[in-house]
Amino acid sequence: QEGKFSGPLKPMTFSIYEGQEPSQIIFQFKANPPAVTFELTGETDNIFVIEREGLLYYNRALDRETRSTHNLQVAALDANGIIVEGPVPITIKVKDINDNRPTFLQSKYEGSVRQNSRPGKPFLYVNATDLDDPATPNGQLYYQIVIQLPMINNVMYFQINNKTGAISLTREGSQELNPAKNPSYNLVISVKDMGGQSENSFSDTTSVDIIVTENIWKAPKP
């Protein structure tokens, strides 16, 4: 009987999670005489197979980062191997899992900031990439400062935009940074996927060296 997993040859779309060990058939196509067998073409990548009787399955785990959509065609053939139905498009959409960790483009960043710079104005960007789907939490990155060295009076002089990786001064940093007292700082920045919201997220860290330069602008005398 026809149902969710079997039926006639017609255009269809299936969604399958990547990384899953093949465990079940995708679909059983039913042949209408004179069709006696089926043929699969397209982006099979030697993963997708159709048996003569119309059983469509995959023989190893899919990888969305290799191919996010497999465009296949299935045709029904008669006893001479002549196409008598189709080919019809069969689309396999590969659903993302969190199987890639974010990585910073550089293991070390260097930048400089002038004392008294406007708070919130970016002077340096750190950037990480994640091969997972950015439209899902798996590929949504969250940046944060782990350590600031030196840390004076437990006050953070630097801040980071959690989404963009833009580093800027805090209000305190704008007011208190003084190259005569501390000409350089080091930040350890982390990036997490899953929007930083999950214990199962992957992370990476990078180091940022910041030079504080003197503000040479002097207020005009009255």
């Epitope: 005489p33 004179p34 001479n80 002549i82």
Partner: antibody
Framework: QVQLQQSGAELARPGASVKMSCKAS????????MHWVKQRPGQGLEWIGY????????YYNQKFKDKATLTADKSSSTAYMQLSGLTSEDSTVYYC???????????WGAGTTVTVSS | EIVLTQSPPLMAASPGEKVTITCSVS???????LHWYQQKSETSPKPWIY???NLASGVPIRFSGSGSGTSYSLTISSMEAEDAATYYC?????????FGAGTKLELK
């Protein structure tokens, strides 16, 4: 070895019918399609149609749809072609040939000659 | 239906001569679906070349086939007396299966 043994020559009157046979040996009869081909003297080859002995499904060239009837008998590994409403145009040689899946006619019979005469 | 046009219809070649027979197909087909048969008088056709370029069992290696799309050919590198016969091309792409009208090759 693989062979297709066709029946002997047929002599028939106009309007009559003839039924010729093609006995297969040396292979599994139901694993291949059987085709019939017409060849008029000094002329080319014309494909009449085929039968799939496994399912008894047959398919005809439109030109021969009302002329030929293809059947098969699994028990004797024999394919048959009946020609009806015979005219002088049907006087010629008819071959059976084995069809190879996604392939070609890999084995041919020796042919059966049909003569239509009043 | 797919029409196959062979040329020349009739030709003569001397022993040792190179021979080329062509088969033009009315619409593009896969090369795996174009075949050649040899027929000598009073005998049934024999499979000669299948899938454009594959020689059937027992066919001498002086024969070769090539082509794609709508243009195919059979070549004999060096004509021999036993090659005198009629050669037919045939398509296995769609129904009805069709043959070319044949090329009769004679020995000069």
């Amino acid at each position: 070895q693989v062979q297709l043994q066709q029946s002997g020559a047929e002599l028939a009157r106009p309007g009559a019918s003839v039924k010729m046979s093609c006995k297969a040996s040396g292979y599994t009869f139901t694993s291949y399609t059987m085709h019939w081909v017409k060849q008029r003297p000094g002329q080319g080859l014309e494909w009449i149609g085929y039968i799939d002995p496994k399912s008894d499904y047959n398919y005809y060239n439109q030109k021969f749809k009302d002329k030929a009837t293809l059947t098969a008998d699994k028990s004797s590994s024999t394919a048959y072609m009946q020609l009806s409403g015979l005219t002088s145009e049907d006087s010629t040689v008819y071959y059976c040939a084995r069809g190879f899946f996604k392939g070609y006619f890999d084995v041919w019979g020796a042919g059966t000659t049909v003569t239509v005469s009043s | 239906e797919i029409v196959l046009t062979q040329s020349p219809p009739l030709m003569a070649a001397s022993p040792g001569e190179k021979v080329t027979i062509t088969c033009s197909v009315s619409s593009s087909i896969s090369s795996s679906n174009l075949h050649w048969y040899q027929q000598k008088s009073e005998t049934s056709p024999k499979p000669w070349i299948y899938g454009t370029s594959n020689l059937a069992s027992g066919v001498p290696i002086r024969f070769s086939g090539s082509g794609s799309g709508t243009s195919y050919s059979l070549t004999i590198s060096s004509m021999e007396a036993e090659d005198a016969a009629t050669y037919y091309c045939q398509q296995w792409t769609s129904y009805p299966f069709t043959f070319g009208a044949g090329t009769k090759l004679e020995l000069k």
